[in-house]
């Protein structure tokens, strides 16, 4: 089947401090030497990506230095890290991978990851 | 709004050049990988190439490879396709059409008439 | 390369009528990569379908899609005017990027 299957877990609670992390895995086709992985969320039936990096099979990925990702690679496997989120982000975290090097090239698109995010209570003045 | 509008199309000679450029606006042109899109007078949609991202990635159909040149210019949010030693078989409208988040071609220009 | 080809090539039906378009693949393809497109006389193409069967923004729900393995169809429940059109299905999972040779929905 000329088609590339990612696997994702269905749903990640963050942490308290608006982390959360998943494991993204391809099937791959071929014998990749350049990957690209974007995450997209998808909430309300709108789309927005919200990272993308690309990186030689091997090698670290590198996001933007802005951005609020961060990941390392491991063979067919992208352990991917989302901070900075707040509770208004929970939604659907899709990972979508691209085999852009050497041809042919191939998509593959998650499920995607439900990512809860609750924000934490507001610690109470105490009176002493 | 999502727009592309392709220009440079005309008519030409067998074996002469012609350059196509495709105008994108009203998304981050660089987030995205763009393909040329063909069609025939009559005929059905044949994919022509397409160019990835930051530009260093392209693939072509077997039909125009080693004639055709895709390539970008993100600071100008613009396309091109160099097409070298046309034939009579390359006459069509060329689209240009932004590969999706998901993966179709989810916004297509108006197309360019090359005779 | 993945050859699609659709069935049939002209599909004549009065405005009301349920269309049926079929688009067999050469190989197994994971329908998940598998798109629709209408075209219209002089028009550029436009994306209906994604992924099989998720229609794109904008898309009426009389438009829908399904399938899997080698065989995906494209169904519309009841023709209006604006239909009557040519309509491609397109692999986009794997590089060359393949569409179909057509259907044209033309009315009765």
């Known amino acids: 089947c000329k088609a590339m299957h990612v696997a994702q877990p269905a749903v990640v609670l963050a942490s308290s401090r608006g982390i959360a992390s998943f494991v993204c895995e391809y099937a791959s086709p071929g014998k990749a030497t350049e990957v690209r992985v974007t995450v997209l969320r998808q909430a309300d039936s709108q789309v927005t990506e919200v990272c993308a990096a690309t990186y030689m099979m091997g090698n670290e990925l590198t996001f933007l230095d802005d951005s609020i990702c961060t990941g390392t690679s491991s063979g067919n496997q992208v352990n991917l890290t989302i901070q900075g989120l707040r509770a208004m982000d929970t939604g659907l975290y899709i990972c979508k991978v691209e085999l852009m090097y050497p041809p042919p090239y191939y998509l593959g698109i998650g499920n995607g990851t439900q990512i809860y995010v609750i924000d934490p209570e507001p610690c109470p003045d105490s009176d002493f | 709004q999502v727009q592309l509008v392709e220009s440079g199309g005309g008519v030409v000679q067998p074996g002469r050049s012609l350059r196509l450029s495709c105008a994108a606006s009203g998304f981050t042109f660089s987030s995205y990988g763009i393909h040329w899109v063909r069609q025939a007078p009559g005929k059905g949609l044949e994919w022509v190439a397409v160019?990835?991202?930051?530009?260093?990635?392209?693939y072509y159909a077997d039909s125009v490879k080693g004639r055709f040149t895709i390539s970008r210019d993100n600071s100008k949010n613009t396309l091109y396709l160099q097409m070298n030693s046309l034939r009579a078989e390359d006459t069509a409208v060329y689209y240009c059409?932004?590969?999706?988040?998901?993966?179709?071609?989810?916004?297509w220009g108006q197309g360019t008439l090359v005779t | 390369e993945i050859v699609l080809t659709q069935s049939p090539g002209t599909l004549s039906l009065s405005p009301g009528e349920r269309a049926t378009l079929s688009c067999r693949a050469s190989q197994s393809v994971s329908s998940s990569y598998l798109a629709w497109y209408q075209q219209k006389p002089g028009q550029a193409p436009r994306l209906l379908i994604y992924?099989?069967?998720s229609r794109a923004t904008g898309i009426p729900d009389r438009f829908s899609g399904s399938g899997s393995g080698t065989d995906c169809t494209l169904a519309i429940s009841r023709l209006e005017p604006e239909d009557f059109a040519v309509y491609y299905c397109q692999q986009y999972g794997s590089s060359p990027w393949t569409f179909g040779q057509g259907t044209k929905v033309e009315i009765k």
């Open positions: 059409a932004r590969g999706g988040n998901w993966g179709p071609f989810d916004y």
């Open positions: 160019i990835w991202y930051d530009g260093r990635n392209k």
């Open positions: 992924g099989a069967s």
